[in-house]
């Protein structure tokens, strides 16, 4: 059903990283515009991106209100210049998105090694606790604030002179590892939510190696 010369949106896709969440769809509009609505299971639909010719809509402000809720969005199609027009069922043509639960599905962004510090044969590696757009009491929460102990980091480390990698895990943002004295090491970290069934792991962080700027070395 729908309006003359109006086509329904299709390929509605959620693109979400660290809770920054955008709904994308097709097609590029020809003589039509779109409005997006989003709702939890309450059915209290909120309109966003009114009468837009874009094929994406930033829904971050809505989903960060409760990242553990499951959301559905729908994209309405209207003839350009005649947005009051409706279909044969008395409603404008629309299509629903897949369900989306931010806490379970948002992609984990690429982490960053904030610093590493060597004290004798120990190295402390710190992962930057990235800020998200999730707010509590008017302050933005970090990834750790949101996920708590559900979030772990895996550290991959290896001697600069060899390719054999070792791993360590932490449910904080810090690692304390043993290293061989006098050897330089390289590090990369990955964020992981083991309890997830999808989007469990981030991409690996950029590699950081001892002897470069981020490190601090203290021989004991």
């Amino acid at each position: 059903s729908g309006t003359t010369n109006t086509v329904a949106a299709y390929n509605l896709t959620w693109k979400s990283t660290n809770f920054k969440t955008i709904l994308e769809w097709e097609p590029k509009p020809v003589n039509q515009v779109y409005t997006v609505q989003i709702s939890t299971k309450s059915g209290d639909w909120k309109s966003k991106c009114f009468y837009t010719t874009d094929t994406e809509c930033d829904l971050t402000d809505e989903i960060v209100k409760d990242v553990k809720q499951t959301y559905l969005a729908r994209v309405f199609s209207y003839p350009a210049g005649n947005v009051e027009s409706t279909g044969s069922a008395g409603e404008p043509l629309y299509e629903n998105s897949p369900e989306f639960t931010p806490y379970l599905e948002t992609n984990l962004g690429q982490p960053t090694i904030q610093s590493f510090e060597q004290v004798g044969t120990k190295v402390n590696v710190t992962v930057e606790d990235e800020r998200t757009l999730v707010r509590r009491n008017n302050t933005f929460l970090s990834l750790r604030d949101v996920f708590g102990k559900d979030l772990i980091y895996t550290l991959y480390y290896w001697k600069s002179s060899s390719s054999g990698k070792k791993t360590a895990k932490t449910n904080t943002n810090e690692f304390l590892i043993d290293v061989d004295k006098g050897e330089n090491y390289c590090f990369s970290v990955q964020a992981v939510i083991p309890s997830r069934t999808v989007n469990r792991k981030s991409t690996d962080s950029p590699v950081e190696c001892m002897g470069q700027e981020k490190g601090e070395f203290r021989e004991i």
Epitope: S1, A8, K41, S42, G43, D44, W45, A89, E91
Partner: antibody, heavy 118, light 108 residues
């Protein structure tokens, strides 16, 4: 466990009124849209009315518009259907149903009979 | 309004049979279709939503498929407790929901 328990049905004369209630438990009531669906004797299912979780948005089938009013009290976890100007064709078992997004009916009450007859 | 037509209206089958019930929409409804089971004097029970998503707690012998106008509910191996009436429901023309007329599944 989700439970929905309807009450308030009975026999009423044409033109009369009834108020159905549906007591909900086992889920966060305000987080879900709710609906009323009816089934006339030996007939199929017929959607009557729906309401969003906040109670702000309501919907009605054309056959009951202007006669029935859906409402909810989230502090009491209860859904209501006020039925006025009842007609013989409103005779049915009325079910309340939990309705994610206001779209489909994932849990149903056991139903309550409303009989409109002189 | 969108009309939903189920076929067959009634069906006789035996325990262990594979059973298929179809539902056709009078116009495209994407995948916005649900299936329900109802036993005599009981409330309907949700089986499938979004055409193919199994409702929590529903046995895996039930499955749904289809998109657009043609949809199928399949019971892979009929059990004694599956004899009931089955309804499809579209929710594409929200909020004007419509149900199919029902398919009564009886013991052969």
């Amino acid at each position: 466990e989700v439970q929905l328990l309807e009450s308030g049905g009975g026999l009423v004369q044409p033109g009369g009124s009834l108020r159905l209630s549906c007591a909900a438990s086992g889920f966060t009531f305000s987080n879900y849209a709710m609906s009323w669906v009816r089934q006339a004797p030996a007939k199929g299912l017929d959607w009557v009315s729906g309401i969003s979780g906040s109670g702000v948005t309501t919907y009605y089938a054309d056959s009951v518009k202007g006669r029935f009013t859906i409402s909810r009290d989230n502090s009491k976890d209860t859904l209501y259907l006020q039925m006025n100007s009842l007609r013989a064709e409103d005779t049915a078992v009325y079910f309340c149903a939990k309705t994610p997004w206001g779209y489909y009916f994932d849990y149903w009450g056991q139903g309550i009979l409303v009989a409109v007859s002189s | 309004d969108i009309q939903m037509t189920q076929s067959p209206s009634s069906l006789s089958a035996s325990v262990g049979d594979r059973v298929t019930i179809t539902c056709r929409a009078s116009q495209g409804i994407s995948s916005w279709l649900a299936w329900y089971q109802q036993k005599p004097e009981k409330a309907p029970k949700s089986l499938i939503y979004a055409a193919s998503s199994l409702q929590s707690g529903v046995p895996s012998r039930f499955s749904g498929s289809g998109s657009g106008t043609d949809f199928t509910l399949t019971i892979s191996s009929l059990q004694p407790e599956d004899f009931a009436t089955y309804y499809c429901q579209q929710y594409n023309s929200y909020p004007l929901y419509t149900f199919g007329q029902g398919t009564k599944l009886e013991i052969k």
